[in-house]
Amino acid sequence: PRSIDVKYIGVKSAYVSYDVQKRTIYLNITNTLNITNNNYYSVEVENITAQVQFSKTVIGKARLNNITIIGPLDMKQIDYTVPTVIAEEMSYMYDFCTLISIKVHNIVLMMQVTVTTTYFGHSEQISQERYQYVDCGRNTTYQLGQSEYLNVLQPQQ
């Protein structure tokens, strides 16, 4: 079998909301993946599991099941959303993200994603990790491909 390539493109959108009383930040982060099937037969993208970390703490998880089938020598772009919560022992971040003296509130998040594909009963997992800047003070949307230059570090191979 030939390879199945997973490329993390970047953040497609980050929508922020706050609970003022609980000093909690809610960030809905939509990411984009390109999955390329280099085989001459179809493969099924069985599931995508993702998590987001801030300062080594997991702040959000998501899982998508039975996603799509990718035809021979084809590529599909898949968006997945991870709801994240920055709260409790990290509530000090609320002060930073809502600081009224500055307009830009960048934080660095680690995006982790694992794609499970199956073909002819065989299962394969491909993982990616990528650090991304997100502005926790405002909503942000990106044009396609605009955010693939946001990498703080290269993905682990």
Partner: antibody
């Protein structure tokens, strides 16, 4: 519909101060920054500053420090701007507007015309 | 403070025409972290408050017709109206949304030829 209802036009003499108001309805007052913007007749827009109703925190344009004072009364869901030492240069339409925290200013009041004249 | 310079100051147009308004900032409006440009465009009709059209240099506000397009990066930005309608006759302002104090361009007045 979201509303920022501003007080009516005022005609004042040079010297003293004037206080104009901006009453919020239909949205959670404490969840937004309230901005104040000046527009002199036929001119562009000048950002005066903002106030955060939740804690009364303010951020002023240095050009308006000492000229404008921004306050809020959360019980009446009203933001106020007081302008002091009035001169003809202060004659303008003053807008209050809101932004969801650091998002762009997305909604504006109808404006209050302040005329400073003998 | 960031100075916003708009050109032209006024434009005479016919309905259906394509229009471009330029805006230059004295400092970059790029958030070097997330690579997003923090520039907004507003439309103001006579006797009305400004209305947000575009934010993040290129993202249309909800309900804004797709004939309005924002582009540009760093210090050079453009608002394009692909086919001007009579209701588009107004003054257009660009605004620095990157740092305080928020600053606006002098405006571009769109008039009917």
């Amino acid at each position: 519909e979201v509303q920022l209802q501003q007080s009516g036009p005022v005609l004042v003499k040079p010297g003293p101060s004037v206080k104009i108001s901006c009453m919020a309805s239909v949205f959670t007052f404490n969840d937004y920054y309230i901005h104040w913007v000046k527009q002199s007749h036929g001119k562009s827009l000048e950002w005066i500053g903002l106030v955060y109703p939740y804690n009364g925190g303010t951020n002023y344009n240095q050009n308006f420090k000492g000229k404008a004072t921004l306050t809020v009364d959360t019980s009446s869901r009203t933001a106020y701007m007081e302008l002091n030492s009035l001169t003809s240069e202060d004659s303008a339409v003053y807008y209050c507007a809101r932004s969801y925290f650091s998002n762009p200013i997305g909604y504006w009041g109808q404006g209050t015309l302040v005329t400073v004249s003998e | 403070d960031i100075v916003m310079t708009q050109s032209p100051s006024s434009l005479s147009v016919s309905v259906g025409e394509k229009v471009t308004v330029s805006c230059k900032s004295s400092q970059s409006l790029l958030n070097s972290g997330n690579q997003k440009n923090y520039l907004a465009w507003y439309q103001q009709k006579p006797g009305q408050p400004p209305k947000l059209l575009i934010y993040g240099a290129s993202t249309r506000e909800s309900g804004v017709p797709d004939r309005f397009t924002g582009s540009g990066s760093g210090t050079d930005f453009t608002l394009t109206i692909s086919s001007v309608q009579a209701e588009d006759l107004a003054v257009y302002y660009c605004q620095n949304d990157h740092s305080y104090p928020l600053t606006f361009g002098a405006g571009t007045k769109l008039e009917l030829k």
